[in-house]
Interface confidence: low
């Protein structure tokens, strides 16, 4: 329910779509600022979202989920959701150029109660409200739906994004910030504000920047899990959802001793769970099962109902079929519907892209490309044909370059190349760094099983994707003499990286000896590490031009950004260069219905997946 404290803040114009704010103070707030929504570049862009006769206005819904994993289409917006106010009324002017459309005022705010997860998925929907004389109220229709997965530390600067959905383009900024007294990149540490901006006293931690100065940090019970526990009072240890025990170190699912059902185990003294009514989850369509004294009960996701969530409450009027699917069903609010999906899509709402590459149609290590309308195989050197089934290689009478050895197998001849070389004759350098996978100016180093990034000062992570500024204070050690902090021209090669490169070189040398000894009986794993696969890995062009830049942490989204600057790495691109057949597939980012409450009377949510180009390894 909306607390009395908040009710005075809610203006009449703000959407009150039955928002119920949690009674507990949120740990922080995710903020989304929509900059523009309009026709994207290129041919076929729509002139207007409104029909020629009726004026309309826009509003937005956002849904947040934790983690980077691909989630079920029906899973809830576990981090929260928000619905915007409606924008100004827009009427199409005949003959006028297509504009950026008038937007609602203000931020969309999604409060979160627990720790900010650091990685999250978002869905942003753009809805159109047609203003007419409909007796049942205004007509709503979904114009565009974009989705993505991002890493974001709480307290960091605004991040900017462009997403395309069909012919529409959405530009927006977002950030996560902690609500006092919570601080930290996950908003899990609690701090009491210092009473005076003086130097910290004896025994207190060094002062952070002024806006985040704290007294001695709150000390939880000794041993309290830093990942799964937190405290609001000194000496206590309260567990995040899914964890239990005095120190929050026991996952809830493993606490079988607390189960009232089943026989006792002789070894543990715990009750061994017997078969229960929820075993195997009888709830369909992503419903969650809970046991009742007599049987079970399904909590159905938005859009489904019935004893086992088997009945869909969505109708064709709601536009439930995506990716060009044809909806068949009655207009009656209670009638069901069926989506007839176009080629390349499946699922009850045509929301899942058929991963035809998973059938491995490309032979001989070819790269599989699912173009939607067709499959393409990009063959490795020496192979040809629609499925790379024809072996063209014949290196008889021709030496393999760069220390490669000629190996006969399967009636054909092949070059087994030395480390770092590929191609038919081992004349091409196989460079895993060609795709520039290291973000924020990191240096890329190839080694025997892939690549390693040496990050510029101030960044960390496997691909240098994380800024190092917990609580606003740099966690980097002082730069050694002659190296200025933040100097993009100079790089520290971490000792671990040095060891890794050294180990890689030594390992490769041993491996080459091993391969050459084995001669004809060389196996696939040896061929891989000896450099046979030739691919210089490049990111495939992404269906969405997802550009993102980090900005300085001003008070709000700033506009001083080059939107067209390509990034080194698509934030949704995954580069893996450590196995023989590297293939690309397009994965539809799934949909996420139900939402949870927003703040200051804002909220939102529904369905429309967009493919993310992913390079991964088979």
């Amino acid at each position: 329910m909306v607390s009395p404290r908040m009710s005075g803040l809610l203006s009449q114009t703000v959407i009150l779509a039955l928002i119920f704010l949690p009674q507990t103070r949120p740990a922080g707030v995710f903020e989304l600022q929509i900059h523009s929504f309009g026709p994207g570049p290129g041919p076929g862009a729509p002139r207007s979202p409104c029909s020629a006769r009726l004026p309309c206005r826009l509003f937005f819904r956002v849904c947040l989920k934790p983690g980077l994993s691909e989630e079920a289409a029906e899973s809830p917006c576990a981090l929260g959701a928000a619905l915007s106010a409606r924008g100004p009324v827009y009427t199409e002017q005949p003959g006028a150029p297509a504009p950026d459309l008038p937007l609602p005022d203000g931020l969309l705010q999604v409060p979160f109660r627990d720790a900010w997860p650091g990685t999250f998925s978002f869905i942003i929907e753009t809805w159109r409200e047609e203003l007419g004389d409909q007796i049942g109220g205004p007509a709503w229709s979904l114009l565009a739906r974009v989705a993505g997965r991002r890493r974001l530390a709480a307290g960091g600067p605004w991040a900017r994004d462009i997403q395309r959905a069909g012919a529409w383009e959405l530009r927006f900024s977002y950030r996560a910030r902690c609500e006092p007294p919570a601080v930290g990149t996950a908003c899990t540490r609690l701090c009491r504000p210092r009473s005076a901006p003086s130097r910290c006293g004896p025994g207190l931690r060094p002062c952070a920047p002024l806006e985040d100065e704290c007294e001695a940090p709150l000390v939880c019970r000794a041993g309290c899990s830093p990942e799964h526990g937190f405290c609001e009072q000194p000496g206590e240890c309260r567990c995040l959802e899914g964890w239990t025990g005095p120190l929050c170190t026991v996952p809830v699912s493993t606490s079988s001793c607390l189960s009232p059902r089943g026989p006792s185990s002789a070894t543990t003294g715990c009750l061994v769970p017997g078969p229960g009514p929820c075993d195997g989850n009888p709830c369909a369509n992503g419903g969650s099962c809970s046991e009742t004294p007599r049987s079970f009960e399904c909590t159905c996701p938005r859009g489904f109902y019935g004893l086992r969530c088997e009945v869909s409450g969505v109708t064709c009027a709601d536009g439930p079929c995506f990716n060009g699917g044809l909806c068949v069903g009655g207009a009656d609010p209670d009638s069901a519907y069926i989506c007839h999906c176009p080629p390349g899509f499946q699922g009850s709402n045509c929301e899942k892209r058929v991963d035809r590459c998973s059938l491995q149609p490309c032979r001989n290590g070819g790269l599989c490309l699912d173009l939607g309308h067709a499959l393409r195989c990009r063959c490795r050197a020496g192979f040809a044909g629609p499925r790379c089934e024809h072996d063209l290689d014949d290196c008889a009478g021709r030496a393999c370059a760069n220390g490669g050895t000629c190996v006969e197998g399967g009636g054909a001849h092949r070059c087994s190349c030395a480390l770092g070389f590929g191609g038919r004759d081992c004349r091409e350098r196989a460079d895993p760094c060609a795709a520039r996978p290291c973000a924020h100016g990191g240096r890329c180093y190839a080694h025997f099983s892939g690549l390693v990034c040496a990050c510029a000062p101030g960044y960390m992570g496997a691909r240098c994707e994380f800024p190092v500024h917990p609580d606003g204070a740099s966690a980097l050690p002082a730069a050694p003499p002659g190296l200025r902090p933040g100097d993009p021209q100079r790089y520290l090669l971490p000792p671990a990286l040095g060891l890794l490169v050294a180990a890689g070189v030594a390992g490769a040398a041993l491996l080459l000896v091993h391969v050459r000894r084995r001669g004809h009986s060389q196996d696939a794993g040896s061929r891989l590490l000896a450099g046979t696969p030739e691919p210089s890995v490049h990111a495939l062009p992404d269906a969405l031009n997802n550009l993102r830049t980090q900005e300085g942490s001003g008070d709000g989204p700033s506009s001083s950004v080059d939107w067209n600057r390509p990034e080194d790495v698509d934030p949704q691109g995954i580069y893996v260069i450590s196995a023989p057949s590297i293939y690309a597939r397009e994965v539809a980012t799934p949909l996420f219905p139900p939402l949870h409450t927003g703040r200051a009377g804002q909220r939102q949510h529904l369905l429309f997946p967009y493919p993310s180009s992913i390079l991964s390894v088979k």
């Epitope: 009150l16 109220g137 709503w140 969505v314 709601d318």
Partner: nanobody, 115 residues
Amino acid sequence: EVQLVESGGGLVQPGGSLTLSCAASGSIFSIASMGWYRQAPGKQRELVAVITSFSSTNYADSVKGRFTISRDNAKNSVYLQMNSLRAEDTAVYYCNARYFERTDWGQGTLVTVSS
């Protein structure tokens, strides 16, 4: 799933008044509009009044000026104040919650206008 529970129906004389209430329980974030429909014996279900999440209202012509729909977000409820009731208003009144992507119905409450 959201449960909708109607109350307030009953027998009333022509010209009298009644207030119907509909309480929603469960996860109701996505409710786009809540409204009242009615179904008289042998007739089709028809819309009486609706109030959207943006607080705009619409009424059937036959009830304009006599019925008023309102909602109380703090109580998750929607109300229908019915004045100057007529015999032709006799029907089972259903609460309706329309989401952006689905519709839920209550069980209905009977309103009988008779002298």
